[in-house]
């Protein structure tokens, strides 16, 4: 058993049929010594008396809010949550496996630049009685500070018969050094509580590996005289790290016909312009990627040819 | 470059960008066996990283690029020695189209651009490698190349910025 926060405790249980469970001793936070009784949740049934209560925690029915009273007055509470371990593996019932970039990916994170700011998100089908708390650091043995905000519900989607909820959190490294080569990964830890079930999820990454620039901005076409060619130009996204002579991007320019089956013409360039042939009813799209480190491409920025 | 003269920024920029491309193309082509995480050994002790105080940020380069260039040079020599070690020259043999040989030569080429024959910076950091067992090598190669990708990305940014803003 360990303390998650004040008056909230997590009991770690090996979860299998007829498991013996864990013996837990609760102590009433009071100077009083006698006349103390214990109840669980809203029940008025007295579970025991005395300053301490010893219980055998085996299942969710044994978890909940234990309260000690004296003469009708509440003295203190202890909330017990369960953390299940099945076949040596901690349960992951609360969050959905996003399976990207690999199986058992529950948390996904992205950064728009090298400033040390990043966003993580996760999915669940649970809509109520759900709380999240997020902590982060750079490195684990001698951790350096990363400050995370509160997790918020950022999207709701209908997937087949059930709803899926996306939660996200923003974090910022306290003393970020955008130009340095990271040697210690960022660690993100999410505590999830659904009713009386506790689970924790972790992710470890370098900012460089989660970089995904915003799409290029101000995408414009300039027809070239007496030619089917156009000059496409664009700018670095505002959110990208500066100076651009140091934090450089590379770009992919694509000409795509109306039909998905039509052949795509692609050009790669380090410049912020390119000359392409604009076909009727086609569109021109540009996306960006860090020039020197192959992290994710941005989403496409597009304009029609006509 | 040792002694304060300016590097050939544009040449260094081109070669460091080529290094980035090679480091990424070499990464999946490090052996004939499937990579299995057979133990999580440290890649090597103390791989040189370009750290916050090394002056490789735009401001640091403007103030005095020597600190940064020396750090990059140290790292290039370190990785060049790693790529020549039995981690890469021993079994499992590299795939026939592996660009590790080219990568190795380019690391040497860039380090020589930074430190021509006869000029010397103080003692280099040398990899302290105990002989690797063949079964460890695929994982070691994978980790070394991952870490090299990060190192050459920073080096390439430095030379790109230098070529754009510090070239005579």
């Amino acid at each position: 058993i360990w303390e998650l926060k004040k008056d909230v405790y997590v009991v770690e249980l090996d979860w299998y049929p007829d498991a013996p469970g864990e013996m837990v001793v609760l102590t009433c936070d009071t100077p009083e010594e006698d006349g103390i009784t214990w109840t669980l949740d809203q029940s008025s049934e007295v579970l025991g008396s005395g300053k301490t209560l010893t219980i055998q925690v085996k299942e969710f029915g044994d978890a909940g809010q234990y309260t000690c009273h004296k003469g009708g007055e509440v003295l203190s509470h202890s909330l017990l949550l369960l953390h299940k371990k099945e076949d040596g593996i901690w349960s992951t019932d609360i969050l959905k496996d996003q399976k990207e970039p690999k199986n058992k990916t529950f948390l996904r994170c992205e950064a728009k630049n090298y400033s040390g700011r990043f966003t993580c998100w996760w999915l669940t089908t649970i809509s109520t009685d759900l709380t999240f708390s997020v902590k982060s650091s750079r490195g684990s043995s001698d951790p350096q500070g990363v400050t995370c905000g509160a997790a918020t519900l950022s999207a709701e989607r209908v997937r087949g018969d059930n709803k899926e909820y996306e939660y996200s959190v923003e974090c910022q490294e306290d003393s970020a050094c955008p130009a340095a080569e990271e040697s210690l990964p960022i660690e993100v830890m999410v505590d999830a509580v659904h009713k009386l079930k506790y689970e924790n999820y972790t992710s470890s990454f370098f900012i460089r590996d989660i970089i995904k620039p915003d799409p290029p901005k101000n995408l414009q076409l300039k027809p070239l005289k007496n030619s089917r060619q156009v000059e496409v130009s664009w700018e670095y996204p505002d959110t990208w790290s500066t100076p651009h002579s140091y934090f450089s991007l590379t770009f992919c320019v694509q000409v795509q016909g109306k039909s998905k089956r039509e052949k795509k013409d692609r050009v790669f360039t380090d410049k912020t312009s390119a000359t392409v042939i604009c076909r009727k009813n086609a569109s021109i799209s540009v996306r960006a990627q860090d020039r020197y480190y192959s992290s994710s491409w941005s989403e496409w920025a597009s304009v029609p040819c006509s | 470059v040792p002694g304060g003269s300016s590097p050939a920024w544009t040449q260094c920029q081109q070669l460091s960008q080529k290094l980035c491309t090679l480091a990424w193309s070499a990464h999946p082509l490090v052996g004939h066996m499937d990579l299995r995480e057979e133990g999580d050994e440290e890649t090597t002790n103390d791989v040189p990283h370009i750290q916050c105080g090394d002056g490789c940020d735009p401001q640091g380069l403007r103030d005095n690029s020597q600190f940064c260039l020396q750090r990059i040079h140290q790292g290039l020599i370190f990785y060049e020695k790693l790529l020549g070690s039995d981690i890469f020259t021993g079994e499992p043999s590299l795939l026939p189209d592996s660009p590790v040989g080219q990568l190795h030569a380019s690391l040497l080429g860039l380090s020589q651009l930074l430190q021509p024959e006869g000029h010397h910076w103080e003692t280099q950091q040398i990899p302290s490698l105990s002989p690797s067992q063949p079964w460890q090598r695929l994982l070691l190669r994978f980790k070394i190349l991952r870490s090299l990708q990060a190192f050459v990305a920073v080096a390439a940014r430095v030379f790109a910025h230098g070529a754009a803003t510090l070239s005579p």
Partner: antibody, heavy 115, light 107 residues
Framework: EVQLQQSGPELVKPGASVKMSCKAS????????MHWVKQKAGQGLEWIGY????????QYNEKFKGKATLTSDKFSSTAYMELSSLTSEDSAVYYC????????WGQGTLVTVSA | DIVMTQSPATLSVTPGDRVSLSCRAS??????LHWYQQKSHESPRLLIK???QSISGIPSRFSGSGSGSDFTLSINSVEPEDVGVYYC?????????FGSGTKLEIK
């Protein structure tokens, strides 16, 4: 085409030393380790060790430490093995091979130790 | 050291037969096992690497299988030129060790 050309047969007296060579061609000599393998007449194969010509790093079979010394010369793309304090037990064919998971072996050097 | 044990020591076969040669390692070597053929007065020739990977120029009748500590070299239709001694080799860890060989004879 990768080729490993080994030096000719040696007839040596007990207690003496012998140094044999393995000249490599058709590839970058420093890009691969060179192994040495012993085979006594009518018997099996025994791994002696290897040298990495890039940095002259060696890895020996404990059994051959003090018996075999592996060296290389980058300029002539040649690997060498010296055997010391020879006895009749050292009479064998010695092969050089570029990485044991590749199909490149020298033709072997026969060493005969006889008074 | 890892001990490689080969069986049988000798195998007499008729051309066209399918044969299996066995090699056992004294501890798990994953798939780090190579097979060689050595004909009389010749250098060894690599037949199979990493337990099952074929080598260019080696006839397709040679195949390898196994992982961990038990390995098999199969020749699916023996030819008269396949006579010789077949060795397996631990390529997992130092010192590299060879099996004592299986001698293949034609009846």
């Amino acid at each position: 085409e990768v080729q490993l050309q080994q030096s000719g047969p040696e007839l040596v007296k007990p207690g003496a030393s012998v140094k044999m060579s393995c000249k490599a061609s058709g590839y970058t000599f420093t890009s691969s380790v060179m192994h040495w393998v012993k085979q006594k007449a009518g018997q099996g194969l025994e791994w002696i060790g290897y040298i990495n010509p890039y940095n002259d790093g060696t890895q020996y079979n404990e059994k051959f430490k003090g018996k075999a010394t592996l060296t290389s010369d980058k300029f002539s793309s040649t690997a060498y093995m010296e055997l010391s304090s020879l006895t009749s037990e050292d009479s064998a064919v010695y092969y050089c091979t570029r990485r044991l998971d590749e199909a490149y072996w020298g033709q072997g050097t026969l060493v005969t130790v006889s008074a | 050291d890892i001990v490689m044990t080969q069986s049988p020591a000798t195998l007499s076969v008729t051309p066209g037969d399918r044969v299996s040669l066995s090699c056992r390692a004294s501890q798990s070597i994953s798939e780090y096992l190579h097979w060689y053929q050595q004909k009389s007065h010749e250098s060894p020739r690599l037949l199979i690497k990493y337990a099952s990977q074929s080598i260019s120029g080696i006839p397709s009748r040679f195949s390898g299988s196994g992982s961990g500590s038990d390995f098999t070299l199969s020749i699916n239709s023996v030819e008269p030129e396949d006579v010789g001694v077949y060795y397996c080799q631990n390529g997992h860890s130092f010192p590299f060790t060879f099996g004592s060989g299986t001698k293949l004879e034609i009846k």
